[in-house]
């Protein structure tokens, strides 16, 4: 069994966690991913999903969790922005390959969140609107759920982590969900 | 239109073990993404859930009962099962099975119509 | 264990009027990260299973009648029938999905005056 390794990244209240999690191009490109949080004894709960089919470079915003899929580079970016010291805790990016379960990519993020001011940009979550003007939609599902089954082998790529640089600069106030429309069964 | 129907004895002696069963009709169990649960409910009280299993047989358990817990799949039968061992008057109840969205969501959208399981020598 | 208790335990309303269900968790329910309150609202009536009704506080399931709403965020919600039609008589039940295990309150029965 594959040793699950975790790397740690303390931030403090207001810095957006950068995290890009790389994936094997020519297998997971289309496939969609998600953004999850571990708990002690639990179920992983999904907290975002890319679309279904993934979609290019093509921003999904969920509160204060944006999502992008980069086909070109193999990699999923997510970014927590405005973090909270609730924000603490262990994350993990996934390949949804129903009905496979969840294809998880390495490593686990541990987040640590404390309280202090932060003057990395970015921080600043008072000043503009959503970046992303993404329609809310009414849907059934957090992500949509595959109807049909898909088989592909899988690889374990590994996931790197950084705080917000001015290039990834992004302020949100009042955020909404922003959620797709699923197929269902 | 997907259904789910428990079936097993209405009927088990304390100490013995309850088995029940939850036959998936109108969509395979194991073509899409759902965890399928169980959740129970004593007469005239309210509802517990018992545990969940994903079609790959990976489970999660109600921590108060998971020592006297297993639950399965079938997928060739499209079902899953529920045993719950050395059983007390305490365990009489409705049984229901109940899709599961799991990691997903954790809310149940689609329930079987229960089965009540008396327990009593 | 997440508890979930509701308010009251039961409740007469008369037909055409308003029916307010309270639902309080022992802790938060809400994600702040994706803003997702991890709370469903189900109905229960007599020798039947558990209807879906409301999911993520306020969503209502599809096919659910308009009338039926769910607010609330964090540790407080509430379930309205703003207009009580008959068949609205039942059982109701708040689930918490935030944390294994999910927690169901202990239900609030609703009644015609």
């Known amino acids: 069994a594959t040793k699950l390794t975790e790397e740690k990244y303390e931030l403090k209240e207001g810095q957006t966690l950068d995290v890009k999690c790389d994936y094997t191009l020519e297998k997971f490109a289309s496939s969609q991913k998600a953004w999850q949080i571990i708990r002690d004894g639990e179920m992983p709960k999904t907290l975002a999903c890319t679309e279904r089919p993934s979609k290019n470079s093509h921003p999904v915003q969920v509160g204060r969790i944006i999502l992008e899929d980069y086909h070109d580079h193999g990699l999923l970016r997510v970014r927590m922005v405005n973090l909270q010291v609730e924000d603490s805790g262990l994350y993990q990016c996934v390949i949804y390959q129903p009905p496979k379960e969840p294809h998880m990519l390495f490593d686990r993020i541990r987040l640590v969140v404390t309280k202090g001011f932060s003057g990395t940009p970015g921080s600043n979550e008072n000043s503009t609107q959503n970046v992303y003007k993404i329609p809310p939609t009414t849907t059934k599902a957090l992500c949509p759920l595959y109807t049909s089954p898909r088989t592909v082998t899988q690889a374990p790529p590994k996931s790197t982590a950084d705080v917000s640089t001015p290039d990834s600069e992004i302020n949100l106030t009042n955020v909404t969900d922003i959620i797709r429309v699923p197929v269902f069964n | 239109q997907l259904q789910l129907q428990e079936s097993g004895p209405g009927l088990v002696k304390p100490s013995e073990t309850l088995s029940l069963t939850c036959t998936v009709s109108?969509?395979?169990?194991?073509?899409?993404?759902?965890?399928w649960g169980w959740i129970r409910q004593p007469p005239g009280k309210g509802l517990e859930w018992i545990g969940s299993?994903?079609?790959?047989?990976?489970?999660y358990y109600n921590p108060s009962l998971k020592s006297r817990v297993t639950i399965s799949v079938d997928t060739s039968k499209n079902q899953f099962s529920l045993k719950l061992s050395s059983v007390t008057a305490a365990d009489t109840a409705v049984y229901y099975c109940?899709?599961?969205?799991?990691?997903?969501?954790?809310?149940?959208?689609?329930w079987g119509r229960g089965t009540l399981v008396t327990v009593s020598s | 264990d997440i508890v979930m208790t509701q308010s009251p335990d039961s409740l007469a309303v008369s037909l055409g009027e308003r029916a307010t269900i309270n639902c309080k968790s022992s802790?938060?329910?809400?994600?702040?990260?994706?803003?997702?309150?991890?709370l469903a609202w189900y109905q229960q009536k007599p020798g039947q299973p558990p209807k879906l009704l409301i999911y993520?506080?306020?969503t209502r399931e599809s096919g659910v009648p308009d009338r039926f709403s769910g607010s609330g965020s964090g540790t407080d919600f509430t379930l309205t029938i703003s207009s009580l039609q008959a068949e609205d008589v039942a059982v109701y039940y708040c689930?918490?999905?935030?944390?294994?295990?999910?927690?169901f309150g202990g239900g609030t029965k609703v009644e015609i005056k």
């Open positions: 109940a899709r599961d969205l799991g990691q997903y969501e954790g809310y149940f959208d689609l």
């Open positions: 109108g969509g395979s169990i194991s073509s899409s993404s759902y965890y």
């Open positions: 299993i994903y079609y790959s047989g990976s489970t």
């Open positions: 802790q938060s329910v809400l994600f702040s990260s994706n803003n997702k309150n991890y």
């Open positions: 993520w506080a306020s």
């Open positions: 689930q918490q999905y935030f944390s294994t295990p999910p927690t």
